[in-house]
């Protein structure tokens, strides 16, 4: 069942290469090869290098394990980025006073525009460069929920480092809720993590768009480097042909 | 480099069994079935048959995905488990007093009994019956750490249901320390999350073992239902074969 | 100048000779084989007349068990009905009707094949694909099949009429 | 493992990954992909035996399941086993586009 | 997905995980496994088409990929994708052993 | 195979114009960005203007800006360059080429057509 | 505008010499190069795109380095149809510029 023939290796290459130029004009619905008659002339645009290298360490940070693939995850994903909304909105007014958090929101017209239906998205992750940091700090991250009530989402130990880091975390499922839902703007806030029995309480991390002095205040965003969404999701014309394909199996 | 005759699937099923049959004997690195001289007459024990059930359990709830599988995770497991200490042990004395924690411990040496040396340990889970609960709840799980110290592990967030349920943790990393530790007694704490600025932090969730008074007193133990580890370990002498046959790759 | 070809001797290897150029090399292929674009490898000429399995269609889970024919060219196959071709279910899809490569493959349109062995004042003769003779019992089952330029037809018992999907004929439901 | 970097520094014959870089341009005729202008996707190769077990096994012959069949297959295939995406780049008309594409980097293989 | 749901249920001539239950008895003539008396193995079947690509290509035959060759394997084969594990319980002379073996019942199939 | 074939050169008078067309065959016309590139008689080359496939975007070299329009009409693979107010520093063979990628390098190349503007 | 010197403007050489034409720009470009060939009364001819790559079916005496400001043409090995005029052509940024040229002589 096994052949012992030698094995022509550029033979081997050869289909694995034409394998692969079906595979990617696949993954990406093309019939064939776009057409590139519009493209202007110069090099890639900042904030799409700026995006791609997002994604590209992104990719480089995450563990090389095969998942079972539904028939969506085949198919290729868009990748966007929406920034948070900047410190000096006035939304961020009535959370200024908190030494154990910091507050980040987001326009929920740019996360539409970047995925017009909640079923689209494939990936949400809020990204935030953490500055260097003294001690271990233990932080959690939680989603505007009600009126004035937070919901728990998840939580990270942060070693302490002289570098600054991105730190990445999986809210695919909440900006899913956002999209379904009519409000303008949402929330996350990060705190540090309150032990029952703990008194120290304050969140001693830097995220780089917030002033490193009382958090909250208005900020210097240090270029397109503050808190951002990072969202994968099947381009709108994609999802209509894979839903018209349905039938195949 | 797929073939279009007819198949044999009588023959492809003869040789899928006989794979398993050598499959079988060399994950348990047997090199022939095990002699059936000794076993005594009658049925399996009743803790052997409720650890079998306890690991059947398990493998239904898990999900089924191929993990890429380092050469010692595809020889079999040995599966024991250790129940905590009973609640009327000394060592609860002084952790009596709090409503917003429940604490368990275990006895090392019983664990070094099941599990020689940290490094044949490939999977330890803390095991608890959640009795009914009338509300959300989200709790915390801490390992004794130092002195009067505890170290935050992970966290859940229990739905309300009528029937009671298996919760597991995973506490690998946990139980390898302590079968490298010179400890007698090694303990978790489970814990309502305190968020910094709520003030009700009362562990609601009962959990079978410790009366539903308060939680610490002298419990009464409902059979083998007590919080207990499920440990995963590679035998101690199929360990030795093991490194013996490093050599090969 | 460094001879590429005697520093290493598998170049151009198992199926051509390596030749040295200055500053550069080629392979010389042998009989079935062109060289690749760089001119530095050798692979397979899929040859017009090589015969192999022709597939009716791609929209069935199973096609590589819709099967026409076992032992065409891939003109004869993607000229006439086929939309694929190759063997052991390794599969060639017919190019498009009406792209390039379909011209190219079948200068003559669809129903023809070029005759490389008639030549009419030095172009090849065209010769109408005869489907009934290669696909017959596949394209017209329970019919008889009548070879037409180009085309075919199926003729079908009374009380049956021809069915262009299911390429048979079929009971009419009175 | 069967990874880079057991297979990509040794001989071994059975089955490994194999090392395949593709350059959009050269290896596709692509000009279409801006970023990146390649990458490793590797390929996996190599013969996994069968081994018909007897009841008298020994252990030489058990040992060769792990690599050769761990699976217990009847028909046993070097496959890929960890895969990472690959992001890219490619216009839209006049509009950019980062998109990923699953599962695009053989990093490792086995015998399944 | 290739599953045993959809496999089970359809009559996939291609690439599908089939039906095989192993009676540790009757199968192996094994006595000495005490718990389970055997189990649902199942296996892979069934050929993965390897599409010569153009790049003309036309949506159809693209849409082969994803379930025929989505790893654009030079050869692709059918593999196990998910897997469960199975406990046994057996006696090594007067003491039972409860052990768990990884990676025994496949559940779905897929072409890689 | 390609082939660009350009015409409409000749001789004219300083602050007339000339239309240049080209005429494209063996490729698929409105999936290429297309340009015109001149060449002074023994000088080097000058990039003079380029429209994308659709027609929808146009870039000019500064000393034809104002003066020289590009177009294309797709159903008739062709494309143009209308020179008004030509002056005697434009006197070059004109050749047209097709952009072949985002990298907008020039991979195929017509044979070229002479304009002199002369009193 | 970005500006692109070419050196030398001329240079002579034997059949099987190993020549090399430089380009440096007024700015860094990336990669956003190509070189082209040009005989006498002949359109020119695309040899290398994005500094380093040969376009299908130029020999592979041709190749091409360099990135950001500073890039090279080479000729591994000299052949008679070689003799011609060579340009570098930027397309980081409108207007795209053209390098005034090498003409590589008979010796």
């Known amino acids: 069942l096994s052949t012992c023939k030698t094995i022509d290796m550029e033979l081997v290459k050869r289909k694995r290469i034409e394998a692969i130029r079906g595979q990617i004009l696949s993954k990406l619905r093309l019939a064939s090869p776009p057409s590139q008659g519009e493209v202007p002339p110069g090099p890639l645009p900042e904030a799409v290098l700026a995006l791609y290298n997002s994604t590209r360490d992104r990719v480089a940070g995450e563990s090389a394990e095969p998942e079972p693939e539904p028939e969506a995850d085949y198919y290729a994903k868009e990748v966007t980025r929406v920034l948070m909304v900047e410190t000096h909105n006035e939304i961020y007014d009535k959370f200024k006073q908190s030494t154990h958090s910091i507050y980040m929101f987001f326009n929920t017209s740019e996360l539409r525009e970047a995925v017009p239906e909640p079923v689209l998205l494939s990936r949400a992750e809020l990204r935030l460069l953490r500055l260097k940091l003294k001690v271990e700090q233990h932080v959690e991250l939680y989603q505007k929920y009600s009126n004035n009530s937070w919901r728990y989402l998840s939580n990270r130990l942060l070693a302490p480092s002289d570098s600054p880091e991105w730190l990445s975390f999986d809210v695919t499922g909440v900006v899913r809720q956002w999209l379904s839902r009519g409000g303008e703007i949402e929330g996350f806030r990060l705190s540090a993590h309150c032990s029952c029995d703990s008194r120290d309480n304050t969140l001693q991390v830097d995220i780089n768009g917030f002033t490193t002095g009382r958090r909250g205040d208005l900020a210097t965003i240090h270029g397109m480097n503050r808190p951002f969404l990072l969202l994968m999701a099947t381009p709108l014309e994609r999802a209509q042909h894979l839903q018209s394909s349905r039938h195949r199996r | 480099l797929s073939t279009c005759k007819t198949i044999d699937m009588e023959l492809v099923k003869r040789k899928r069994i006989e794979a398993i049959r050598g499959q079988i004997l060399s994950k348990l690195r047997l090199a022939s079935p095990p002699s059936q001289g000794e076993v005594p007459p009658g049925p399996l024990p009743e803790a052997v048959l409720a650890l079998y059930n306890s690991t059947r359990d398990r493998v239904a709830g898990e999900s089924a995905e191929p993990e890429p599988e380092p050469e010692a995770d595809y020889y079999a497991k040995e599966v024991t488990r250790v129940l905590m200490v009973e609640t009327h042990n000394e060592i609860y004395d002084k952790f009596k007093q709090s409503t917003h924690s429940i604490y368990m411990f275990f006895n090392t040496s019983e664990l070094r009994e099941a599990v020689p040396e940290p490094v044949l340990l490939s999977r330890a889970e803390l095991r608890l019956l959640r009795l009914k609960l009338k509300v959300e709840q989200h709790v915390e799980l801490y390992q004794k750490y130092s002195n009067n110290s505890w170290r935050y592990l992970s966290n859940r967030l229990l739905a309300p249901s009528d029937s009671p349920e298996w919760l597991s943790f995973d506490v690998t990393g946990v139980v390898r320390q302590w079968l490298s530790r010179g400890g007698e007694i090694e303990g978790f704490r489970l814990s309502a999350h305190c968020s910094c600025d709520s003030r009700d932090n009362t562990l609601q969730v009962d959990i079978n073992g410790f009366t539903t008074g308060r939680r610490g007193d002298l419990a009464t133990i409902h059979g083998m239902n007590r919080p207990f580890l499920l440990l995963m370990a590679t035998p101690l002498e199929r360990a030795q074969h093991l490194q013996s046959s490093r050599h090969r790759r | 100048d460094i001879d590429e070809c005697s520093q290493d001797p598998s170049l151009c290897l198992p199926h051509g000779a390596c030749k040295n150029l200055q500053g550069s090399y080629v392979c010389v292929c042998d009989e079935g084989f062109t060289p690749t674009q760089d001119q530095h490898g050798c692979e397979e000429v899929e040859q017009p007349h090589h015969k192999k399995e022709c597939y009716l269609n791609f929209d069935d889970t199973v096609f590589c068990d819709s099967v026409l024919a076992t032992n065409v060219t891939q003109q004869e196959c993607c000229c006439s009905l086929g939309a694929g071709w190759g063997d052991h279910c390794e599969i060639y899809p017919c190019p498009v009707y009406s792209s390039a490569e379909f011209h190219s493959l079948c200068p003559d349109g669809k129903g023809y094949t070029q005759d490389n062995n008639i030549v009419n004042y030095g172009i090849p003769a065209h010769r109408d694909i005869d489907e009934c003779m290669l696909f017959g019992s596949e394209i017209c089952k329970e019919g008889k099949c009548v070879n037409t330029q180009p085309g075919y037809e199926c003729y079908c018992k009374q009380g049956f009429y021809y069915d262009g999907n299911l390429l048979e004929c079929v009971d009419v439901d009175e | 493992a069967l990874d880079t970097n057991y297979c990509f520094s040794s001989t071994e014959k059975n089955c490994c990954v194999r090392q395949l870089y593709i350059d959009f341009r050269k290896d596709l005729g692509w000009k279409w992909i801006h970023e990146p202008k390649g990458y490793h996707a590797n390929f996996c190769l190599g013969p996994c035996p069968y081994i018909w077990s007897l009841d008298t096994q020994y252990s030489k012959v058990l040992a060769l399941y792990n690599q050769h069949n761990p699976g217990a297959s009847a028909a046993p295939c070097c496959v890929p086993q960890a895969l990472e995406p690959l992001p890219i780049v490619y216009y839209v008309g006049r509009k950019p586009k980062v998109e990923q594409l699953s599962n695009m980097i053989v990093r490792s293989c086995k015998c399944s | 997905a290739l599953d045993t749901n959809y496999c089970f249920s359809s009559t996939e001539k291609n690439c599908c995980v089939r039906q095989l239950y192993i009676d540790f008895r009757k199968d192996l003539g094994w006595k000495w496994i005490h718990e389970p008396k055997g189990y649902h193995a199942n296996f892979c079947l069934g050929p993965c088409p390897y599409i010569w690509s153009l790049d003309t290509q036309y949506s159809k035959v693209l849409a082969l990929y994803n379930q025929h060759n989505p790893g654009a394997s030079a050869a692709p084969c059918c593999v196990p994708q998910a897997l469960e594990p199975l406990p046994i319980v057996y006696y090594v002379g007067r003491k039972p052993k409860v052990e768990q073996l990884s990676n025994m019942i496949v559940r779905s199939c897929k072409c890689s | 195979q390609v082939q660009l074939v350009e015409s409409g050169g000749g001789v004219v008078q300083p602050g007339r114009s000339l239309r240049l067309s080209c005429a494209a065959s063996?490729?698929?016309?409105?999936?290429?960005?297309m340009t015109w590139v001149r060449q002074a008689p023994g000088k080097g080359l000058e990039w003079v203007s380029a429209?994308?496939?659709?027609?929808?975007?146009?870039y000019f070299a500064d000393s034809v800006k104002g003066r020289f329009t590009i177009s294309r009409d797709n159903s008739k693979n062709t494309l143009y360059l209308q020179m008004n107010s030509l002056r005697a520093e434009d006197t070059a063979v004109y050749y047209c080429?097709?952009?072949?990628?985002?990298?907008?390098?020039?991979?195929?190349w017509g044979q070229g057509t002479l304009v002199t503007v002369s009193s | 505008d970005i500006q692109l010197t070419q050196s030398p403007s001329s240079l002579s050489a034997s059949v099987g010499d190993r020549v090399t034409i430089t380009c440096r720009a007024s700015?860094?470009?990336?990669?956003?190069l190509n070189w082209y060939q040009q005989k006498p009364g002949k359109a020119p001819k695309l040899l290398i795109y994005?500094?380093?790559n040969l376009q299908s079916g130029v020999p592979s005496r041709f190749s091409g380095s360099g990135s950001g400001t500073d890039f090279t043409l080479t000729i591994s090995s000299l052949q008679p149809e070689d003799f011609a005029t060579y340009y570098c052509?930027?397309?980081?940024?409108?207007?795209?510029?053209f390098g005034g040229g090498t003409k590589v002589e008979i010796k």
């Open positions: 052509q930027q397309t980081y940024t409108v207007p795209l510029t």
């Open positions: 994005a500094a380093s």
């Open positions: 700015q860094s470009i990336s990669s956003y």
């Open positions: 080429a097709r952009v072949s990628s985002g990298h907008w390098d020039f991979d195929e």
């Open positions: 063996g490729f698929t016309f409105s999936s290429f960005a």
């Open positions: 429209i994308s496939g659709s027609g929808a975007a146009t």
